[in-house]
Interface confidence: low
């Protein structure tokens, strides 16, 4: 069974330390080739995927992953017990919730089993690599004739998340966005009853419990108001 793991691009905060460990050799050999960088993301603190680009190897190689937590009770070296594969070659490791300790320094080591001197070790701060699930259950309430309130839920501790709300009418070229703190509600004070509004929200593990840079996926959109699309000159541009 081949598993393709899609992870967000970029990983700004992951490499607190990154170093390649090699033994000196007389001539250029496989042990001097750098190993691919490991990128880890903690999904809703339910599981973590640590992945690498297996195609960067000069020949197909089943790299192995070990991990431990620095200066903690969990400093025993652990072998990956659940590898992810790309075209039958190891390309990642999945760790389950019980193996995730957010606030201890996570050390991950990639190794070429055919050339044990060829290894790379990275130290990661997992609290900066959390990606929550997308917000759910968006609801709109009319507070007054012209004021709307948007509420939503997250499958996560509310106080750990900040949010970004985007909204637009069918007449708008672009989204208007507004940051929202952990209270997860948003008010739009002035609503035009003749327009149809679309709202969506995404969330991030920041700043009260970590400093993650990556946002969740966008929620499913929610709509409000009359559908005036027939007279809307921008409709085709929006749907193109």
């Amino acid at each position: 069974l081949n598993t393709t793991i899609l992870t967000p691009n970029g990983n700004e905060d992951t490499t607190a330390d990154f170093f390649l460990t090699t033994m000196p050799t007389d001539s250029l050999s496989v042990s001097t080739l750098p190993l691919p960088e490991v990128q880890c993301f903690v999904f809703n603190v339910e599981y973590m995927n640590c992945t690498w680009n297996s195609s960067s190897e000069p020949q197909p190689t089943n790299l192995t992953l070990h991990y431990w937590y620095k200066n903690s009770d969990n400093d025993k070296v652990q072998k990956c017990s659940h590898y992810l594969f790309s075209e039958e070659i190891t390309s990642g490791c999945q760790l389950q919730k019980k193996e995730i300790h957010l606030y201890q320094t996570f050390v991950v080591q990639l190794q070429d089993p055919r050339e044990p001197r060829r290894q790379a070790t990275q130290m990661l701060k997992l609290q900066n690599l959390v990606i929550p699930w997308a917000p759910e259950n968006l609801t709109l309430h009319k507070l007054s004739e012209s004021q709307l309130e948007l509420n939503w839920n997250n499958r996560f501790l509310n106080h750990c998340l900040e949010h970004l709300v985007q909204y637009r009418t069918d007449w708008d070229h672009s989204w208007t966005e507004q940051s929202v703190d952990y209270r997860h509600k948003f008010s739009l004070p002035s609503v035009d009853g003749q327009k149809r509004y679309t709202f969506r929200v995404r969330s991030r593990f920041n700043p009260l419990c970590g400093s993650a840079q990556h946002w969740s996926e966008w929620s499913h959109p929610i709509h409000w108001g009359s559908n005036t699309s027939k007279e809307n000159p921008f409709l085709f541009a929006l749907e193109a």
Partner: nanobody
Framework: QVQLVESGGGLVQAGGSLTLSCAAS????????VGWFRQAPGKEREFVAS????????YYDDSVKGRFTISRNNAWNTVNLQMNNLKVEDTAVYYC???????????WGQGTQVTVSS
């Protein structure tokens, strides 16, 4: 089932100190995170501070940063909230909460009243 019991609330003058305690029914917390929240009359419940099992994931709301300190004992069966330089606006019922994972606080205490007078 984890039962949480708060203690240490009371009446104090502005500028004074109190220490709230949250105990997990005489045994260790089986949870990943413990937090303190508060609710003032007519207001929503708001986050105050939280601490992770390892003790190094500690976070505060901006309104209490530098004045309040959350800590846990090594046995992980008591979590304290040391509150210094109390202000009238800190008056509220303070609740302790604990979560098995990171999706929700599954367990809540009954709350302890903190009143700060001017």
């Amino acid at each position: 089932q984890v039962q949480l019991v708060e203690s240490g609330g009371g009446l104090v003058q502005a500028g004074g100190s109190l220490t709230l305690s949250c105990a997990a029914s005489g045994r260790t917390f089986s949870t990943d995170v413990v937090g303190w929240f508060r609710q003032a009359p007519g207001k929503e419940r708001e986050f105050v501070a939280s601490i992770s099992r390892s003790g190094d994931g500690i976070y505060y709301d901006d309104s209490v940063k530098g004045r309040f300190t959350i800590s846990r004992n090594n046995a992980w069966n008591t979590v304290n909230l040391q509150m210094n330089n109390l202000k009238v606006e800190d008056t509220a019922v303070y609740y302790c909460a604990a979560g098995d994972g990171w999706s929700t606080y599954d367990y809540w205490g009954q709350g302890t009243q903190v009143t700060v007078s001017s």
